[in-house]
């Protein structure tokens, strides 16, 4: 299936040009998306091209500026947030990145009624997290690991927690491992729907071992960065959840929410919190051995001013074939009765589907079914449930938005997006206004991305929000590669792949092949999305064929494929890449003497193991920031898939699955190993150990480190990295410079 046909005709050939590496590094062909900042059922805010904050009312068709770019610029604001009562805006400046989601910033409060900044009781700096209450203009913020509350922006703050301490106790914000591997947010506090209560997590990292690495900077002596970071099998953070009444915060103070007994009996995690009403909250907990999850619904007891979580409101989710959930355990979406909910989990056939839980999980009513997966529940209204899935035409790498009418019986299903722009758009997400009165659809491809606004009742398109016209025009004289998404059937396993082919691809010729791999559990690389990136350039200008293959362990094709890698990472992911390469060779257009593989992070691990597989298939390969041993990676992630590195659990496979154990096998391949020295995620230690093992085995290899760079290798390092990798591959494939 050719998703992006080449537009090359003989008459045009002279004016068409190939992509250059410079195009990619400059972001010449990057696209824009439009996500409305919804403030009601029919209004949204958007930052205009000239940086004014503009309010749009869909029903009146009117728009007006509420905050000028001059005000934004006066404090160098890069972000803003309107209070729900529409009286104030916080302006965020001095953004300073910490980890993947976390950052600190300076916040100013601007009073829209009088056009002035709020003076008196200004916020301290830098703040770790700040948010408005869902109603009115209360503020909750985290400063120096403690939580503060303001009833109004100009009021003095009320301090909620006092035990916060850097790298020891975190209140309202996650520690490193919870941020990266469990919550995937920079915050760990949640307002109740009307702002009566504020729930928050406290993480105690006192006993967690610390990862320490040098940050070289410009000083005479390097700094040492210390992060409490639990590696596989190490001591984990201790979590507690508290709730405080924000109307009378001093009255009884924070009340702890009890942990379900079956969870509290051994090491556990808190996985998410969902408010149902102002006096009902839902907490999700997970055993350290992550195949048992408990959803606990708790109620406020006015008489005792405490939170009660009856056993009858505990719902257990257990996996017998793998871990609980997909990448994370799914979160519930509550219905209007404030007790029943919709949730995605595996059905009896091993496919993730939407279920409706009214009393017990055992009596759950299955809402969707089939040999495909429901991926996200966007919104539940009185009469509709909106969700995304990969059902349409049986392509796992697509995403369409569906509406199920839950108000009628039997419920009817409608695909909202399947036929909108069928060739251009096969991978959607959505953003809904209050009560789903309107929604925005954001299409990521395979054609040029487009964002549109729709009526939530009729699904009618109202207007185009962003169609990337400039990008479309810029690409008119570019020879883009062709892309196809197909599947291989091998030993009862379906291997979907994406192949990126040079513009003048000719099946009768032979081409060098580059495999790009990620391959981590519950990931998906073969997606129907638009991208003009490094591999597009390699196909367009350098004449390479690039392939991405989703093997065992990848997501959205059922539990059999997903959980195949359970407790044995590094085996089937590698086998399936190798199997695919053999199939590609059989297709007849691959030069089998010029095959390479590359990957980043988990992909660096897989590419390293593939190069060291002893098959002789690969001439060369690159590993960027690879994991080299699962004993070096984070507990929450690693143990989910591998269990514990103990003798009575899975230590043997932890030892067998290292890159270092295969050092000898790198002798007959050209290996480029790359890592940032300040990688807080996959520590430089991983590559240091690979390099040591290769040196000890007297195996030649190439390496590049990036001083003071983290897992993302951003900024100027990006340019250097891709230039360096390009040279390496061109040399490997004997392509002239």
């Amino acid at each position: 299936i050719v998703l992006r046909p080449s537009r090359v005709h003989n008459s045009e050939e002279n004016t068409m040009r190939a992509l250059t590496l410079k195009d990619i590094l400059n972001g010449t062909f990057s696209y824009k998306t439009f996500f409305p900042n919804w403030i009601s059922g029919q209004e949204y805010l958007h930052q205009s091209a000239d940086n004014n904050i503009v309010l749009y009312n869909i029903e009146t068709g009117q728009s007006y500026t509420i905050l000028s770019n001059r005000t934004m610029k006066s404090v160098n604001a890069s972000n803003y947030g309107l209070s729900p009562d529409r009286q104030f805006v916080y302006l965020e400046s001095d953004y300073s990145k910490l980890w993947r989601y976390s950052y600190t910033a300076t916040y100013y409060i601007y009073d829209l009624s009088n056009g002035e900044f709020v003076r008196g009781n200004e916020l301290p700096r830098p703040i770790q997290y700040l948010c408005w209450s869902p109603v009115g203009s209360k503020l909750a913020y985290v400063y120096q690991n403690n939580i503060y509350l303001k009833q109004r922006p100009g009021d003095p703050p009320f301090q909620i927690t006092f035990n916060g301490r850097e790298n020891k106790i975190f209140n309202g914000i996650p520690d490193w491992v919870y941020e990266e591997e469990m919550l995937a947010t920079k915050y760990a506090l949640w307002w109740s729907p009307n702002g009566k209560f504020l729930a928050y997590a406290e993480f105690n990292d006192t006993d967690i071992p610390v990862i320490a690495y040098s940050y070289y900077g410009d000083e005479q002596y390097p700094r040492t960065i210390n992060i409490p970071y639990p590696k596989a099998g190490a001591k984990n953070p201790v979590v507690r959840i508290f709730i405080i009444d924000t109307t009378y915060p001093a009255y009884v103070g924070p009340q702890e929410v009890p942990v379900p007994a079956m969870i509290a009996s051994s090491d556990y995690y808190f996985s998410w919190l969902t408010w149902v009403t102002d006096e009902r909250v839902c907490l999700q907990w997970l055993k350290r051995v992550q195949n048992v999850s408990v959803l606990s619904i708790c109620d406020f007891r006015e008489d005792w001013q405490t939170w009660d979580c009856p056993k009858t409101q505990e719902h257990i989710e257990e996996s017998r074939t793998g871990w609980a959930g997909g990448f994370f355990v799914s979160t519930p979406v509550f219905s209007y009765d404030a007790i029943s909910y919709y949730k995605i989990f595996s059905d009896k056939d091993g496919y993730k589907h939407i279920h409706y839980i009214k009393d017990t999980v055992e009596n759950a009513i299955q809402i969707t079914s089939g040999k495909w997966e429901a991926i996200n529940i966007f919104r539940v209204t009185q009469d509709s449930l909106f969700y995304s899935s990969n059902e349409f035409e049986e392509y796992p790498g697509r995403r369409n938005i569906y509406r199920i009418s839950i108000g009628s019986y039997p419920p009817s299903k409608k695909c909202v997006t399947c036929h909108l722009r069928k060739e251009r758009c096969q991978y959607y997400t959505a953003s809904f206004s209050d009560y789903a009165k309107y929604y925005a659809l954001v299409c990521y491809g395979p054609g040029i991305p487009i964002s549109t606004l729709h009526d939530g009742r009729t699904d009618q398109e109202i207007k185009i929000l962003e169609e990337n016209k400039e990008l479309e025009n810029a690409l008119k004289n570019i020879q883009l590669p062709k892309e196809e998404i197909k599947k291989l059937e091998v030993d009862e396993i379906t291997l979907w792949y994406k192949m990126i082919l040079p513009p003048q691809f000719d099946r009768s010729k032979k081409y060098p092949l580059l495999i790009q791999v990620y391959g981590g559990p519950c990931s998906q690389s073969v997606r129907s999305v638009f991208a003009v990136n490094w591999i597009s350039y390699l196909a367009s200008k350098e004449g390479m064929v690039i392939a991405l293959v989703d093997g065992r362990g990848t997501a959205f094709q059922g539990d059999k494929l997903l959980y195949a890698v359970y407790r044995k990472l590094g085996v089937y992911e590698v086998e399936d890449q190798i199997t695919a390469v053999r199939k590609f060779i059989e297709m007849g257009f691959i030069d089998e003497k010029r095959i390479a593989i590359w990957g980043w992070s988990y992909g660096g691990y897989v590419s390293s193991l593939a190069l060291a597989s002893g098959t002789g298939l690969f001439k060369c390969g690159i590993a960027v920031a690879p994991v080299s041993s699962w004993e070096y990676y984070a507990s929450v992630y690693t143990e989910r898939f591998m269990g514990l590195p103990t003798k009575d659990d899975n230590l043997e496979h932890y030892k067998n699955s290292t890159v270092m154990a295969r050092a000898e096998y790198f002798r007959n391949v050209d290996y480029l190993l790359i890592h940032g020295t300040a990688d807080d995620n996959v520590h430089f230690q991983n590559s240091a150990q690979i390099a040591k093992a290769l040196v000890n085995a007297q195996v030649d290899f190439q390496a590049m480190w990036y001083s003071d760079q983290n897992h993302g290798l951003s900024g100027l390092s990006t340019n250097h990295l891709y230039t360096h990798m390009t040279h390496f591959l061109k040399q490997c494939f004997s392509l002239s410079d």
């Epitope: 009601s40 209004e43 309010l55 009117q62 000028s68 805006v89």
Partner: nanobody, 115 residues
Framework: QVQLQESGGGLVQAGGSLRLSCTVA????????MGWYRQAPGKRREWVAT???????NYADSVKARFTISRDNAKNTVYLQMNSLKPEDTAVYYC?????????WGQGTQVTVSS
């Protein structure tokens, strides 16, 4: 520049009532969220009440249960019914969208409450 014309102010004794009107020019529709604001002598302008696009109303604590905001879509007019007036309600009253449209304030209407 959006035209907003406030009227209905005056001098009233404490405990009395007034009804303020705000007529909005074509360029803005009162079906947008609209608000009343006031500025007392020597003080900053402050928010008083809002009526949302959906018709929900919100009030500053100081006027709750005494003031009522409403609108007439056909006349493109927003109202503020003020009962049980107090001397501290003395101010110039303005209407605007909520949040306010930048640089678009009318002349306002003076409300004076004598004790």
């Amino acid at each position: 520049q959006v035209q907003l014309q406030e009227s209905g102010g005056g001098l009233v004794q404490a405990g009395g009532s007034l009804r303020l009107s705000c007529t909005v020019a074509e360029s803005i529709d009162v079906r947008n969220a609209m608000g009343w604001y006031r500025q007392a002598p020597g003080k900053r302008r402050e928010w008083v009440a809002t009526i949302t696009t959906g018709g929900r109303t919100n009030y500053a604590d100081s006027v709750k249960a005494r003031f009522t905001i409403s609108r007439d879509n056909a006349k493109n007019t927003v109202y503020l019914q003020m009962n049980s007036l107090k001397p501290e309600d003395t101010a110039v009253y303005y209407c605007n969208a909520a949040p306010p449209i930048l640089n678009s304030w009318g002349q306002g209407t003076q409300v004076t409450v004598s004790s």
